[in-house]
């Protein structure tokens, strides 16, 4: 049975041309974590495995950095980085948990956060 | 669809280097989700797995065969490349390049391979 | 290392008959990470099942793999003359490094 929650920074917005931390938190289960995958829509942005450490998707090498420490950074923001995001917490044993957040990138300077929220 | 090639010198002289190179056809080695791997097969024995490397150069070998072995890439020409050192004829095989989806997860195997070439170690 | 011992070394069937072959593990081995494979002679392995049970692309109903923890199981139900190979387990773990089973030959009886 699948206990887990997957915390995350719900919605966001960043400015056009600054850097956004995506972070998930997995809590409430013993799961091993033995990967996590970061996706845009059905696009592949980076993976974090257990064993193997992190692995940035050719596209993004120059735009995405791995952490702190299970999140990414998105640098050199545009506005077609706005869409939605999902952490994928592959888990031993008990299977695959998902977050989503929301980035909205903001041609002007009045990006600010929303408000944290929970996906079971 | 995807394909696999291996190539190299089909005799190596003991205590030398073996080199052999894998292109790939028909899709790119800069694949966010694969590794690409080293697999081989002494003549009428099992498979024994040499290691693997992601496009941006990270590896993970085994253990056994690690001292000996470098794999390296280049995305330019979509191809890997495996060296083992100070060979000895215990490392005469068939030489294997294949498509490692170690990242993948629940589908981790090596799904796609090259036909293999055979290499003899002797003097 | 993860040892895998598959049984038997040789299997003498005939065509229309159902093979099970046998792969088992040293130590626990997520379902995930087992694969089966068939080869045959002056050929590259083929991937057959990947995450114990499900068959790759283009692989026939007959072939199914079950298993889980350290004991796992390939199955053809029909032999068909093309089966006739060599088959190996594989585990795809990274530490302890992935490792091979030595092998089950499905022979003509």
């Known amino acids: 049975m699948m206990t887990g929650t997957i915390e995350t920074t719900g919605n966001i917005s960043a400015e056009k041309g600054g850097s956004i931390i995506l972070q998930c938190h997995l809590s409430s289960t013993t799961a091993q974590v033995t990967q996590v995958n970061w996706e845009q829509q059905d696009q592949l942005l980076a993976i974090c495995n257990a064993d193997l450490g992190w692995h940035i998707s050719p596209s993004f090498k120059d735009r995405v950095a791995p952490g702190p420490g299970l999140g990414l950074t998105l640098q050199s923001l545009t506005v077609n980085d706005t869409g939605e995001y999902f952490c994928i917490y592959h888990t031993y044993p008990d299977g695959t948990y998902t977050g989503r957040i929301f980035l909205e990138v903001l041609e002007s300077s009045v990006a600010e956060h929303g408000a944290r929220f929970q996906i079971p | 669809q995807l394909q696999l090639q291996e190539s190299g010198p089909g005799l190596v002289k003991p205590s030398e280097t073996l080199s052999l190179t894998c292109t790939v056809s028909?899709?790119?080695?800069?694949?966010?989700?694969?590794?690409w791997g080293w697999i081989r097969q002494p003549p009428g024995k099992g498979l024994e797995w040499i290691g693997s490397?992601?496009?941006?150069?990270?590896?993970y070998y085994n253990p056994s065969l690690k001292s000996r072995v470098t794999i390296s890439v280049d995305t330019s020409k979509n191809q890997f490349s495996l060296k083992l050192s100070s060979v000895t004829a215990a490392d005469t095989a068939v030489y294997y390049c294949?498509?490692?989806?170690?990242?993948?997860?629940?589908?981790?195997?090596?799904?796609?391979w090259g036909q293999g070439t055979m290499v003899t170690v002797s003097s | 290392e993860i040892v895998l011992t598959q049984s038997p070394g040789t299997l003498s069937l005939s065509p229309g008959e159902r093979a099970t072959l046998s792969c088992r593990a040293s130590?626990?081995?997520?379902?995930?990470?087992l694969a089966w494979y068939q080869q045959k002679p002056g050929q590259a392995p083929r991937l057959l099942i990947y995450?114990?049970?499900s068959r790759a692309t283009g692989i026939p109903d007959r072939f199914s793999g079950s298993g889980s923890g350290t004991d796992f199981t390939l199955t053809i139900s029909r032999l068909e003359p093309e089966d006739f190979a060599v088959y190996y387990c594989?585990?795809?773990?990274?530490?302890?490094?992935?490792?091979f089973g030595g092998g089950t030959k499905v022979e003509i009886k």
């Open positions: 294949a498509r490692d989806g170690v990242l993948t997860l629940n589908k981790r195997s090596f799904d796609i």
């Open positions: 490397i992601y496009y941006s150069g990270q590896t």
């Open positions: 594989q585990q795809h773990t990274v530490r302890p490094p992935l490792t």
């Open positions: 130590q626990s081995v997520s379902s995930s990470y």
């Open positions: 028909g899709g790119s080695i800069a694949s966010g989700s694969y590794y």
């Open positions: 995450g114990a049970s």
